[in-house]
Amino acid sequence: QKSSIEKCSVDIQQSRNKTTERPGLLNCPIYWQQLREKCLLFSHTVNPWNNSLADCSTKESSLLLIRDKDELIHTQNLIRDKAILFWIGLNFSLSEKNWKWINGSFLNSNDLEIRGDAKENSCISISQTSVYSEYCSTEIRWICQKELTPVRNKVYPDS
């Protein structure tokens, strides 16, 4: 039995998979900030987690996925005030009783030190300094991401 948030996450991910392949993204769109091989968009408005998830999807992006502690720190360095919380693409899966990224993978316990409870209707937010479990219905800001396509040097055969 999947929660409504899990269903929403799966539905959006499936619809994204169905869309036709687009050319790779070489540069970040206007208003998006480049962080290594990603483009990030920090919202100025607030939403519950599932609305944030949907908003990123409409922008042909996803809620932020964080690979490791290093990426977390670099993302946190872009947050301008300690009193701003941002949703990322991680929530508690009741069926698997574990933190689950919206791409279907589970959280490596060493990656993020989460402050707060791991329980139903809990979603993950980040601030300038920490990672928090908050109720998914809480209205806070969110971060969308787009992956940049690495530019490869073309090798032409001798003519």
Partner: antibody
Framework: EVQLVESGGGLVQPGGSLRLSCAAS????????MSWVRQAPGKGLEWVSA????????YYADPVKGRFTISRDNSKNTLYLQMNSLRAEDTAVYYC????????????WGQGTLVTVSS | EIQMTQSPSSLSASVGGRVTITCRAS??????LNWYQQKPGKAPKLLIY???SLQSGVPSRFSGSGSGTDFTLTISSLQPEDFATYYC?????????FGQGTKVEIK
Amino acid sequence: EVQLVESGGGLVQPGGSLRLSCAASGFTFSSYAMSWVRQAPGKGLEWVSAISGSGGSTYYADPVKGRFTISRDNSKNTLYLQMNSLRAEDTAVYYCARGGYLPDAFDYWGQGTLVTVSS
Amino acid sequence: EIQMTQSPSSLSASVGGRVTITCRASQSISSYLNWYQQKPGKAPKLLIYAASSLQSGVPSRFSGSGSGTDFTLTISSLQPEDFATYYCQQTYSTPLTFGQGTKVEIK
């Protein structure tokens, strides 16, 4: 209907302690950041402290940092402010308000509770 | 810390009159500016949030404008119940700060 009701104010000597409470009803308490805001007699409004919906994240205004502690019990729909090492300049009406994480406005306020610090 | 400066500190106006209160931030705060009304012995009440959005239940005679550092609260036709003190507040950065207040009195 959203309601916030503060209690716990009173007269306390300098250096003393007091704990304020704010009972919330009419909304999903755990989904909202909450704040304390104070107003000294005849003066303007001063933000004191805020706490996230889960209670995991807190922050404070410089004049109260290290002396005041904000907390919440979501099972009781109650917000608290533990005030230690009280000073005369802490004398004010203390309001609890819904909101407190940027860019929240304070959309609902309690009626306030008066804290008087005097010997 | 961002300083918020309101002007005037007080004003006298007649019922039916138009009132304008200004608020200036010491640095740009985008549109993260709220306006509150407070009557003696009562808690503040949110009127306007995000510089120009009217809070639910607030009469349409109240309006807000501005962005960056300069903001305005306008009461288009002052009513007897509008005599009160008005505060601006920024929610751009911590600490959250308020203006010193503008008292609107009956002429």
